[in-house]
Amino acid sequence: ELCDDDPPEIPHATFKAMAYKEGTMLNCECKRGFRRIKSGSLYMLCTGNSSHSSWDNQCQCTSSATRNTTKQVTPQPEEQKERKTTEMQSPMQPVDQASLPGHCREPPPWENEATERIYHFVVGQMVYYQCVQGYRALHRGPAESVCKMTHGKTRWTQPQLICTGEMETSQFPGEEKPQASPEGRPESETSCLVTTTDFQIQTEMAATMETSIFTTEYQ
């Protein structure tokens, strides 16, 4: 079930998911001067079953001047520079990743995609926060947020993160041990939708993940 709202905004911080739950939509957005091809997919969809998940549909962009270009190739390095990235940017994973059951990894880029990715998350999704460059993380607790369903409404839990203006960059999802410890999560924030196992797996994924594209616009 889709989450109504965006994850909470934390001053001087960005968030991302390590993996995306089935049902997640990624809008097919194109950079300036390009548009989604007519009758092209509106969005990519994380789909599959408990043993194998992958992204359905392909996003395709065409020049808004020349409307018959429908190539679907991986961007050249200079094109990739337009994407919002962090120092952690490195080669993309293949699309089909089932290391976390029922989840998809970050989809590969498409030619002339927009600089920001617009995701629509589903209940149970967890996102992780990191202070932007030039800010340092002060942790009160876990720097994560989970989309939960309560009384028929969706809501995101509040991440316990403050970013202060010191010229230090923090590791992602956090160099402080308590953040990566399930025991460190306040009881009130424990979600029946995201188990300790999920959390541990995702934390391990955070440490080993090869894809890290940050987005600030999710709705």
Epitope: L2, G23, M25, N27, E29, R32, G33, R35, R36, K38, S39, S41, L42, Y43, L45, T47, D56, N57, S64, I118, H120, E217, Q219
Partner: antibody, heavy 114, light 107 residues
Framework: QVQMQQSGAELVRPGTSVKISCKAS????????LGWVKQRPGHGLEWIGD????????NYNEKFKGKATLTADTSSSTAYMQLSSLTSEDSAVYFC???????WGQGTTLTVSS | DIQMTQSQKFMSTSVGDRVSVTCKAS??????VAWYQQKPGQSPKALIY???YRYSGVPDRFTGSGSGTDFTLTISNVQSEDLAEYFC?????????FGGGTKLEIK
């Protein structure tokens, strides 16, 4: 909370034009396609076309080319649909809708009558 | 244009029953199908996207299924508030098209 607020009912003469508005809120207007749908009793729902406010790009149903013109004002997060050379066949309820994830306006009733 | 056919214009059911609304596409549309609920005097409300995924706030008694050309919206444990017209829509290729609608009547 995503909301699409449409302009009020219109009663117009045949042969004239009308411009219906749709003010979007609760999301980044320039990042989403916004579509228009016509509903007439006994005719179901018909997709007129859609517009991407971020670039002004449009797609039209061939049936409505020359009849409908879609525009958007990004400064006010408002989309517009102008219908021209109106006839009684254009009498209907018109909905604007954010395309995906879908969120529809309340509808604007257009009556074309002499 | 792709035709979306909802063969049953009306369906009658009782509270607590299970009902299935069907929709057939004239050609393969993959899973690019949405379902909408429209109550009298209101605008359509999106229930399902990509054939089987529920929108936020949609009760889990609404289930979508199908791919290719045949699609079904199932309402289990029908409630009186489910009295409405249900439309399918394909957004696989332009122009996007809708089914003619199925009106659900509560006995």
């Amino acid at each position: 909370q995503v909301q699409m607020q449409q302009s009020g009912a219109e009663l117009v003469r045949p042969g004239t034009s009308v411009k219906i508005s749709c003010k979007a809120s609760g999301y980044t207007f320039t990042n989403y396609w916004l579509g228009w749908v016509k509903q007439r009793p006994g005719h179901g729902l018909e997709w007129i076309g859609d517009i991407y406010p971020g670039g002004g790009y449009t797609n039209y149903n061939e049936k409505f080319k020359g009849k409908a013109t879609l525009t958007a004002d990004t400064s006010s997060s408002t989309a517009y649909m102008q219908l021209s050379s109106l006839t009684s066949e254009d009498s209907a309820v018109y909905f604007c809708a954010r395309v995906t994830p879908a969120s529809w306006g309340q509808g604007t009733t257009l009556t074309v009558s002499s | 244009d792709i035709q979306m056919t909802q063969s049953q214009k009306f369906m009658s059911t009782s509270v607590g029953d299970r009902v299935s609304v069907t929709c057939k596409a004239s050609q393969n549309v993959g899973t690019n199908v949405a379902w909408y609920q429209q109550k009298p005097g209101q605008s359509p409300k999106a229930l399902i996207y990509s054939a089987s995924y529920r929108y936020s706030g949609v009760p889990d008694r609404f289930t979508g299924s199908g791919s290719g050309t045949d699609f079904t919206l199932t309402i289990s444990n029908v409630q009186s508030e489910d009295l409405a017209e249900y439309f399918c829509q394909q957004y696989n290729s332009y122009p996007w098209t809708f089914g003619g609608g199925t009106k659900l009547e509560i006995k």
